[in-house]
């Protein structure tokens, strides 16, 4: 707590300008009026204050706005945003996307801090859903943002927002997240033609069911191995050798290099060896010829 000392004669700040950087901590406290600071917050960011000086300015704003800062002040916080705690931010009501962008810009190039996470949470909750413009903004600053959300949180993403998602935004998503995002993407891109549709849907296919993979295999999509390896194992297992061959097109040769890894390994174990041999890749581990395959899960379902 800074001691309350009288402002020396002639030092009372008439405006927020660069002369203030020569003020000592106690002088800033005594000579800068909080209301003046609030109305001229846009100037603070242009002045190279030290962390000590920013602490004093924050203390002044905290005293002026004990219930939380108004958006007119928040929008111009600039570097002062870095001094805010998550507890401070929880008091805010941020509704403008411009305010969000301005604050994210301050933290640009750094990992998502607890302050930024709280700010985003407050903003999204205030909007009720993760709309396209917000998602556009967030993924531009934090490509991994989408994958940091829980499946429950992702369920509030409207299909229209999916257009803002880039392939790299999904790099760290797990299957549970893709399970939620895939149906939204399918809906969002449903009116596109075959090849364009595949380009857009490809990043989301880790959440695709078997029937959709079968449908894609009829469209000459030439799925690359990296995408195939991210597919759900349970969705790949029922595919026939012919379907996988059609799905991968010229990339089918890549199966050999991946035969010990899931989902390829598990898929091989479910195929007849003579069917696998038709690929001419030397894939081993299929069901030997003459063996009868009983699908016990199907039998259980019937009984």
């Amino acid at each position: 707590e800074v001691e309350k000392t009288a402002c020396p004669s002639g030092k009372k700040a008439r405006e927020i300008d660069e002369s203030l950087i020569f003020y000592k901590k106690w002088e800033l406290e005594a000579c800068v009026d909080a209301a003046l600071l609030a109305t001229q917050m846009d100037r603070v960011n242009a002045i190279p204050f030290t962390y000590e000086q920013l602490d004093v300015l924050k203390h002044k704003l905290d005293e002026l706005y004990p219930q939380g800062y108004p958006e007119s002040v928040i929008q111009h916080l600039g570097y002062l945003f870095l001094k805010m705690s998550p507890e401070d931010i929880r008091k805010w009501n941020v509704t403008s996307l411009e305010t969000l962008k301005a604050l994210l810009e301050v933290n640009k190039g750094h990992e998502m801090s607890p302050q930024v996470a709280t700010l985003i949470d407050r903003f999204v909750k205030g909007r009720g859903q993760l709309d396209k413009d917000t998602l556009d903004t967030l993924t531009a600053f934090y490509p991994g943002y989408l994958c940091s959300l829980s499946p429950e949180e992702l369920s509030s993403v409207p299909p229209s927002s999916i257009w803002a998602v880039r392939p790299q935004d999904l790099d760290t998503c797990d299957p549970r997240q893709l399970d939620v995002l895939y149906p939204k993407a399918r809906l969002a891109f449903q009116n596109m033609n075959g090849s364009e549709y595949f380009v857009k849907i490809q990043s989301f296919l880790g959440g695709a069911p078997t029937e959709d993979l079968k449908a894609l295999s009829q469209q000459n999509v030439s799925m690359d191995l990296a995408t195939f390896m991210k597919l759900r194992t349970d969705a790949v297992l029922p595919l026939t050798v012919a379907e996988v061959q059609k799905l991968l097109g010229p990339h089918v040769e890549g199966l050999k290099a991946e035969e010990r890894h899931r989902p390829v390994r598990d898929w091989i174990l479910r195929q007849r060896q003579d069917d696998l041999d038709t690929l001419g890749l030397g894939l081993q581990g299929g069901i030997p010829n003459g063996y009868l395959v009983l699908d016990l899960s199907m039998q259980e379902a019937l009984s």
Partner: antibody, heavy 119, light 110 residues
Framework: QVQLVESGGGVVQPGRSLRLSCAAS????????MSWVRQAPGKGLEWIGV???????FYADWVKGRFTISRDNSKNTLYLQMSSLRAEDTAVYYC?????????????WGQGTLVTVSS | DYQMTQSPSSLSASVGDRVTITCQAS??????LAWYQQKPGKAPKLLIY???DLASGVPSRFSGSGSGTDFTLTISSLQPEDFATYYC????????????FGGGTKVEIK
């Protein structure tokens, strides 16, 4: 290659003046606060002063007006003007880039230039 | 005035030892503290900033902790190349400062 190179050191008589330079390559000096630090033989690091991105200068309490920091953004060079030199100013002088617009850690250093004050 | 005090001024240790160096600020500097390593005849090198963040390229055996007035630099398993002098520096204020650096701690071979 990102580097800072000091020059201008040497032997100088007590009471005389000397100007050190710090030339930057691979970085734009005007985008950072810059500092001077010195180290007397066998002693620790001693902060001299800093110039922020706006050109405002701040000095350690002991400097007492004898040293002046300046910069020439067109030459991408930082300077330290030293006057009324004494034997105790004998040291290696380093320039350093501050990881901030104002004040913070020094994340890039020059190799140093030796100043010897002796009659 | 803001003053930085380091201890010990020197210590002897062996390869593989866990080494701890402390730095104390005369007033709170929150987490605005950096640590540097300096080898004879060379410029200092930034190891840690903001009390605990590792600078680029610094091995993970170095770690920093603390906030307010008390800070610690720890080397979990001393390596031959770690024998050097270590300095702390406050990055909180540039006014009322006699020296932003601590006095240094020399880590020598036992």
């Amino acid at each position: 290659q990102v580097q800072l190179v000091e020059s201008g050191g040497g032997v100088v008589q007590p009471g005389r003046s000397l100007r050190l330079s710090c030339a930057a390559s691979g970085i734009d000096l005007s985008s950072y606060a810059m500092s001077w630090v010195r180290q007397a033989p066998g002693k620790g690091l001693e902060w001299i002063g800093v110039i922020d991105i706006s050109g405002n200068r701040f000095y350690a309490d002991w400097v007492k007006g004898r040293f002046t920091i300046s910069r020439d953004n067109s030459k991408n060079t930082l300077y330290l003007q030293m006057s009324s030199l004494r034997a105790e100013d004998t040291a290696v002088y380093y320039c350093a880039r501050v990881d901030s617009r104002a004040w913070g850690p020094f994340n890039l250093w020059g190799q140093g230039t030796l100043v010897t004050v002796s009659s | 005035d803001y003053q930085m005090t380091q201890s010990p001024s020197s210590l002897s240790a062996s390869v593989g030892d866990r080494v701890t160096i402390t730095c104390q600020a005369s007033q709170s500097i929150f987490s605005y503290l950096a640590w540097y390593q300096q080898k004879p005849g060379k410029a200092p090198k930034l190891l840690i900033y903001d009390a605990s963040d590792l600078a680029s390229g610094v091995p993970s055996r170095f770690s920093g902790s603390g906030s307010g007035t008390d800070f610690t630099l720890t080397i979990s398993s001393l390596q031959p190349e770690d024998f050097a002098t270590y300095y702390c520096q406050q990055g909180y204020t540039r006014s009322d400062v006699d020296n932003a650096f601590g006095g240094g701690t020399k880590v020598e071979i036992k």
